[in-house]
Interface confidence: low
Amino acid sequence: MSLLSVPHTESVSLSTGSTVTIEARPLVCFFNEPHLQVDFHTEMKEDSDIAFHFQVYFGNRVVMNSREYRTWKEEVESKNMPFQDGQEFELRILVLEDKYQVMVNGQAYYNFNHRIPVSSVKMVQVWRDISLTKFNVSN
């Protein structure tokens, strides 16, 4: 199975009902504290606003946030940690009417209410300490 380059950046157009699917594996064991970061940007630039920031501190916690006018807003933290050390996982981010719902291996674990219109999202970036085998957007 071929690996996608990381950071992986893709132009997208999202709306209610869209699903972003990511298949990946942590690069190192959890003891070494790998991260996964997924950012939904409002422009095709890394320094643009972020409608949805999803960061996994493997073996520890998950943080969600948005960045508006270059300022990070109120962080939402979850201690739910369904990711397993050394195991491949499937991450699905569902765009619902009122929120993003994040599913891990088919189960819903995280919710993040929309702060910036989904129609503003132009690019998704997946990066940090993972090997990436799949990135797909379905509308």
Epitope: F30, F31, G59, N60, K79, N80, M81, P82, F83, Q84, Y109
Partner: nanobody, 121 residues
């Protein structure tokens, strides 16, 4: 297989403290996340506290500030200390082990049989 056996339950007065123990035998105890759940009569099983294999702890909002969870890997035992007990803490308390750090009863790999804690006013 991982066998889990609790002890320490019983009848206590409101305002008192209690320490529950959960002794493990079988598989490598230290590689599991350890959880405590409870089930009050007629209610669903609810999450109480978690202890990650790396040592991080987390207590549910219902017991926050009154709860301490710890483990002794040398003794293969996990402990739940509950302070300032209330009548609404009355329940059967279950120890559980999971490979995933998830506060969902359905995600647990192993369960103990449960120990009854009754808090009288």
């Amino acid at each position: 297989q991982l066998q889990l056996v609790e002890s320490g339950g019983g009848l206590v007065q409101a305002g008192d403290s209690l320490r529950l123990s959960c002794a493990a035998s079988g598989r490598t105890f230290s590689s599991y996340h350890m959880m405590w759940f409870r089930q009050a009569p007629g209610k669903e099983r609810e999450f109480v506290a978690a202890l990650a294999w790396r040592g991080g702890t987390y207590c549910a909002n219902s017991v926050k500030g009154r709860c301490t969870i710890s483990r002794d890997n040398a003794q293969d035992t996990v402990y739940l200390q509950m302070n300032s007990l209330k009548p609404e803490d009355t329940a059967v308390y279950f120890c559980a082990a999971s490979r995933r750090y998830v506060f969902d009863p359905s995600a647990m790999d192993y369960w103990a049989k449960g120990t009854l804690v009754t808090v009288s006013s």
